[in-house]
Interface confidence: low
């Protein structure tokens, strides 16, 4: 039985040329996280495997950085980066959990950063 829930940064916006951190957090389950995939629509951005570590897709290597934690940092944002992003948690024994984030990249400086890094 899948009891876990995924919290995400939700709908966020950022300025063209800036950076943003996408974060998901799996809670309410004791399942072991074996791998997390980050995908943008139908494109694989990155994989974080608990044993093998990170793999960044070659086409994104210059603009995608791993972390913090299981999150993903996108740099040098363009308007084309606007869209849906998915964090896909592969767990044992629960199975797969998926979180969705919608990122809007804005031309102007009026972008509201809905997912800001906070000092803990």
């Amino acid at each position: 039985m899948m009891t876990g829930t995924i919290e995400t940064t939700g709908n966020i916006s950022a300025e063209k040329g800036g950076s943003i951190i996408l974060q998901c957090h799996l809670s309410s389950t004791t399942a072991q996280v074996t791998q997390v995939n980050w995908e943008q629509q139908d494109q694989l951005l990155a994989i974080c495997n608990a044993d093998l570590g990170w793999h960044i897709s070659p086409s994104f290597k210059d603009r995608v950085a791993p972390g913090p934690g299981l999150g993903l940092t996108l740099q040098s944002l363009t308007v084309n980066d606007t869209g849906e992003y998915f964090c896909i948690y592969h767990t044992y024994p629960d199975g797969t959990y998926t979180g969705r984030i919608f990122l809007e990249v804005l031309e102007s400086s009026v972008a509201e950063h809905g997912a800001r890094f906070q000092i803990p």
Partner: nanobody
């Protein structure tokens, strides 16, 4: 107790250099990911650089070519070599890593202040 301790901050003139260190202690494993972030007065924390255990590195555009991140896996320590420092690099620099093998939680240090001023 699992903790991160940064050191190496201080006052430096524009164009100068500093080397920050981040020591991870209390771990029963070697962190697979370590990174540096910074927070300037009145601004939000921003990512600076990341390094993976395998040696892969990533940098924010604002520091690329001036900063170098590295890690000594045997010591569970990360470093940030900062060259050609500018006044806009003034900030509290924080180190971060993953808390457990599944990298579900983040762990942060207390920060070290870097001031670039003449």
């Amino acid at each position: 107790e699992v903790q991160l301790v940064e050191s190496g901050g201080g006052l430096v003139q524009p164009g100068g250099s500093l080397r920050l260190s981040c020591a991870a202690s209390g771990f029963t494993f070697s962190p697979s990911w370590m990174g540096w972030f910074r927070q300037a007065p009145g601004k939000e924390r921003e990512w600076v650089a990341s390094v993976l255990r395998g040696g892969y590195t990533w940098y924010a555009d604002s520091v690329k070519g001036r900063f170098t991140i590295s890690a000594d896996n045997s010591k569970n320590t990360a470093y940030l070599q900062m060259n050609s420092l500018k006044p806009e690099d003034t900030a509290v620099y924080y180190c971060a890593t993953d808390r457990g093998p599944a990298m579900v939680f983040n762990l942060w240090g207390q920060g070290t202040l870097v001031t670039v001023s003449s």
